[in-house]
């Protein structure tokens, strides 16, 4: 759970449920100042094992955008282009926070929310040798 | 923003900041039912890059463990196990949302917040720059 | 309408060749993968070779490695498969499927097949 | 490689019955899994891949699921069209392997 002693100076929580609900203040703080969000831009391409990003849209949700990455190839891209059957493209799979408008439609009340989604793909080999 | 006209069954914010700081339920619910979470658990060894998961703890944060992969090679693990150091190991990056206790200690007011987590790591082709 | 018309099967003795083609139209034959997948009399289906679309990347099983080879004509819409060094246990319809995408993973396509006896 | 043991090898059912038909790979094959139809004297016809996607034309009685080794294909009320045999075919280690089939006979 995340109960942890109450400051002084924290706000009151009216709400029975407390600490079900929670207040949130969305302005986003980033703390990615340092990080050039466009270095791994192009990773997708140059990939041995590249993918296409896909846009997934909900307004109900808090973000919106989701991008979700679809691995191009079943097997895995070789120096000379083509595919290598003995290795596999597969999605590299993220559990992410999210939050649900709840109930529907409101612009104010939210419900936190688990979704897994790809971020990308590794190029892996298929069977696993057990040593004796 | 995500300014979508209120229901009328929706909860009142009595917040002078509204739409800035929102009600949001802890009651986490989970999309992935259908998902095993242990597929592609074994995805960071059997890459042909490889990582390494490290546990990033801060009690501050919900959630509070976040694990963050380290690639382990420079390069890419051929199929012989030994590392080309023509390709590059890479990790995939993705922004993930978190909520970050403000004030500090507090259990029930938290800001959103924005962070860069690598997800795994990914094989590509090195970017030659040409001298003309 | 896609199809793919297998020919060149027959009768032909252990240690011979044959040579198989597989004619394929109503698609753009050079942005798919293709295989051979054969059958013997009453049973079930086995993976012979794999082509991707420019004929860059092939593989064979273990069980005709170094005796059959495939190869594509995509100017002529055409897959091949040479047989060599051909035995009993290859008796078999041999089928040319097509995979949906580039590469021949699984075959959404297959022709009718065409039957190879080997026997003296 | 990769073994595919399809059961059972063989069913009788009728016309509106529910047939439930297993694939159990020897090791995960992590969805790449394809059922296919065939008919006496006639090729296979593709039904379903990645386990669960059925491909278009097919009808929904037909449906693919499963996950990890273990893979069904179930017909939810069976028609004489579909009296026929099935295989499976996994697509996740070279070489591809196919189970070796279940035929469905009338009753």
């Known amino acids: 759970g995340i109960a942890i002693p109450r400051n002084s100076g924290c706000p009151n929580s009216e709400d029975k449920n407390f600490p079900r609900t929670v207040m949130v203040n969305l302005n986003i703080h980033n703390r990615n100042t340092s990080t050039n969000p466009k270095r791994s831009s192009d990773y997708y391409n140059r990939s041995t094992s590249p993918w296409n990003l896909h846009r997934n849209e909900d307004p109900e949700r808090y973000p919106s955008v989701i991008w979700e990455a679809k691995c191009r190839h079943l097997g895995c891209v070789k120096a000379d282009g083509n595919v290598d059957y003995h290795m596999n493209s597969v999605p590299i799979q993220q559990e992410i926070l999210v939050l649900r408008r709840e109930p529907r439609h409101c612009p104010n009340s939210f419900r936190l929310e688990k979704i897994l989604v790809s971020v990308g793909c590794t190029c892996v080999t298929p069977i696993v040798h057990h040593v004796a | 923003g995500i300014a979508i006209p209120r229901n009328s069954g929706c909860p009142n914010s009595e917040d002078k900041n509204f739409p800035r700081t929102v009600m949001v339920n802890l009651n986490i619910h989970n999309r992935n039912t259908s998902t095993n979470p242990k597929r592609s658990s074994d995805y960071y060894n059997r890459s042909t890059s490889p990582w390494n998961l490290h546990r990033n703890e801060d009690p501050e944060r919900y959630p509070s463990v976040i694990w963050e992969a380290k690639c382990r090679h420079l390069g890419c693990v051929k199929a012989d196990g030994n590392v080309d150091y023509h390709m590059n190991s890479v990790p995939i990056q993705q922004e993930i949302l978190v909520l970050r206790r403000e004030p500090r200690h507090c259990p029930n007011s938290f800001r959103l917040e924005k962070i860069l987590v690598s997800v795994g790591c990914t094989c590509v082709t090195p970017i030659v720059h040409h001298v003309a | 309408e896609v199809q793919l018309v297998e020919s060149g099967g027959g009768l032909v003795q252990p240690g011979g060749s044959l040579r198989l083609s597989c004619a394929a139209s109503g698609f753009t034959f050079s942005t798919y993968g293709m295989s051979w997948v054969r059958q013997a009399p009453g049973k079930g289906l086995e993976l012979v070779s794999i082509?991707?679309?420019?004929?860059?990347?092939?593989f064979y099983p273990d069980s005709v490695k170094g005796r059959f080879t495939i190869s594509r004509d995509n100017s002529k819409n055409t897959l091949y498969l040479q047989m060599n060094s051909l035995r009993a246990e290859d008796t078999a319809v041999y089928y040319c499927a097509r995979d949906p995408r580039h590469d021949g993973y699984f075959f959404d396509y297959w022709g009718q097949g065409t039957l190879v006896t080997v026997s003296s | 490689d990769i073994q595919m043991t399809q059961s059972p090898s063989s069913l009788s059912a009728s016309v509106g019955d529910r047939v439930t038909i297993t694939c159990r790979a020897s090791e995960d094959i992590y969805d790449r899994l394809a059922w296919y139809q065939q008919k006496p004297g006639k090729a296979p016809n593709l039904l379903v891949s990645?386990?669960?996607s059925l491909e278009s034309g097919v009808p929904s009685r037909f449906s693919g699921s499963g996950s990890g080794k273990d893979y069904t294909l179930t017909i939810s009320s069976l028609q004489p069209e579909d009296f026929a045999t099935y295989y499976c075919q996994q697509y996740w280690s070279v070489p591809w392997t196919f189970g070796g089939g279940t035929k469905v006979e009338i009753k």
């Open positions: 082509i991707n679309h420019n004929g860059g990347s092939t």
């Open positions: 990645g386990a669960t």
